[in-house]
Interface confidence: low
């Protein structure tokens, strides 16, 4: 699997986990049909993907979730992919809204984020939600990766 | 195209296809804008992309579909990307799920999905749709593809 | 961040940018967290990005709007990737399809397009959508990339 | 890292049944596709019952549908596959799996000789 000593392949795919934190950042765990290549990018608290290599890397998210317009606030879901840098606040780098559904109880629907940044070693990425209490948690509905290019 | 004679490129991009069959499994095919690097990944009977060696690869797809609320079981519908390795059941890698439209005759939604995940030799990746009737096959609604990294 | 001499890496993100262009070919521009990794990929005009090597290209787009039924045409918000190569008609690669939300003044949705293509020297991306004015220019909400395999 | 132990093998004459066991130290079942694979002298190894213990999706092979059941005890740790109405076919060493970062992790197997 290697691209050579120097440059071993780094990349990572965490599924997500239901949680009772009320934070709205998304918790995940190596588990299922996860990916962790190596200790070069390490799951840190459950919450968020920390890599130890600059470099350029291609980012992913998936969410799922169940909501309906009347249960919900007027404000869309929103899914936030976010980065925190070492010594620098947090940043959004990318991020996707749905409005709710009219559908009753609830209606499913999946956002998908992804694009390439540059990460410095010792940052981390996470993805944030409006109402972490909406996300699916059923098999392949809601996860999150990276990949180094 | 090549990384070396060891370590070819790997990667394929094919388009949906129209098909009779009542099956939930989408078809391919190598037509329009397609991708086939090589022979170290194939599209066969038309539905599976298999790669020959083993790694981490990237593995996308994207389904364009045309539902109504009324006219649709009220499941809603669902992407599913699956895995099938040899001498091993079929597994999902990612779901995606979105709550039928309530615009007539029908309301078009898309879904992507992707991740990174490790393929042994000789695995093949298909996708499975709830109702293979509602997705849409005009020029680049469709589509379902995968690379090495 | 190179992989060799000959053999640099190539990947670009670039921002969306609102437009009182009529056009329905999405702005872009290099701010906030983007990337542009060296010159063998430029963003043209603000519009397109161009690659000055062969081969084969992970291109993707996300795109945020709001709409709201009533206020659209009939015709669902689709967004379109394209490609221009040098000598030849432009061709679609890529397109999503949303349904325009009932929820007033209007309703957030995202799309997310992304695959492998072969992009030759001098080739463009870009893409299109039916409303730009329905799109939404938030700190991450819109975003188009590419990366060289 | 998951260790894996089956145990409950042995000689059983057709039309018996015997029921496997396989102990999981390490890490908990949770949320892993756990499965019984078989390899018969000779043969290609081959998947025989595998559960998601996720949402408790089943899968069984063919040859085996209504004859085995899969199932789990999560607080013990521990999978199981009960085997009735075996066939002289069914004899094989079983092996359980953990399906884990995209390959299984395998137990050391347990002989089964279904024989008269």
């Known amino acids: 699997m290697q691209k050579g000593d120097q440059n071993p392949q780094i990349a990572a795919h965490v599924i997500s986990e239901a949680s009772s934190k009320t934070t709205s950042v998304l918790q995940w765990a190596e588990k299922g049909y996860y990916t962790m290549s190596n200790n070069l990018v390490t799951l840190e608290n459950g919450k968020q993907l920390t890599v130890k290599r600059q470099g350029l890397y291609y980012i992913y998210a998936q969410v799922t979730f169940c909501s309906n317009r009347e249960a919900s606030s007027q404000a869309p879901f929103i899914a936030s992919l976010c980065l925190k840098s070492p010594g620098r606040f947090e940043r959004i780098l990318l991020r996707a809204a749905n409005t709710h559904s009219s559908a009753k109880p609830c209606g499913q629907q999946s956002i998908h984020l992804g694009g390439v940044f540059e990460l410095q070693p010792g940052a981390s990425v996470f993805v944030n939600v409006t109402d972490p209490s909406q996300v699916s948690h059923g098999t392949g509905f809601t996860s999150f990766g990276l990949l180094k290019l | 195209m090549q990384k070396g004679d060891q370590n070819p490129q790997i990667a394929a991009h094919v388009i949906s296809e129209a098909s009779s069959k009542t099956t939930s499994v989408l078809q391919w095919a190598e037509k329009g804008y397609y991708t086939m690097s090589n022979n170290l990944v194939t599209l066969e009977n038309g539905k599976q992309l298999t790669v020959k060696r083993q790694g981490l690869y990237y593995i996308y797809a994207q389904v364009t579909f045309c539902s109504n609320r009324e006219a649709s079981s009220q499941a809603p519908f669902i992407a599913s990307l699956c895995l099938k390795s040899p001498g091993r059941f079929e597994r999902i890698l990612l779901r995606a799920a979105n709550t039928h439209s309530s615009a007539k005759p029908c309301g078009q939604q898309s879904i992507h999905l992707g991740g990174v995940f490790e393929l042994q030799p000789g695995a093949s990746v298909f996708v499975n749709v709830t109702d293979p009737s509602q997705v849409s096959h005009g020029t680049g609604f469709t589509s379902f593809g995968l690379l090495k990294l | 961040m190179q992989k060799g001499d000959q053999n640099p890496q190539i990947a670009a993100h670039v921002i969306s940018e609102a437009s009182s262009k009529t056009t329905s070919v999405l702005q872009w521009a290099e701010k906030g967290y983007y990337t542009m990794s060296n010159n063998l990929v430029t963003l043209e005009n603000g519009k397109q990005l161009t690659v000055k090597r062969q081969g084969l290209y992970y291109i993707y787009a996300q795109v945020t709007f709001c709409s709201n039924r009533e206020a659209s045409s009939q015709a669902p918000f689709i967004a379109s990737l394209c490609l221009k190569s040098p000598g030849r008609f432009e061709r679609i690669l890529l397109r999503a399809a949303n349904t325009h939300s009932s929820a007033k003044p209007c309703g957030q949705q995202s799309i997310h397009l992304g695959g492998v293509f072969e992009l030759q020297p001098g080739a463009s991306v870009f893409v299109n959508v039916t409303d730009p004015s329905q799109v939404s220019h938030g700190t991450g909400f819109t975003s188009f990339g590419l990366l060289k395999l | 890292e998951v260790q894996l132990v089956e145990s409950g093998g042995g000689l059983v004459q057709p039309g018996g049944s015997l029921r496997l066991s396989c102990a999981a130290s390490?890490?908990?079942?949770?949320?892993?596709?756990m499965g019984w694979f078989r390899q018969a002298p000779g043969k290609e190894r081959e998947e025989v019952a595998t559960f998601y213990t996720g949402d408790g999706r089943t899968y069984y092979a063919d040859s085996v549908k209504g004859r085995f059941t899969i199932s789990a005890d999560n607080s013990k740790n521990t999978a199981y596959l009960q085997m009735n109405s075996l066939k002289p076919e069914d004899t094989a060493v079983y092996y359980c799996a953990a399906w884990l970062n995209g390959g299984n992790r395998w137990g050391q197997g347990t002989l089964v000789t279904v024989s008269s």
């Open positions: 390490g890490r908990t079942f949770s949320s892993y596709y």
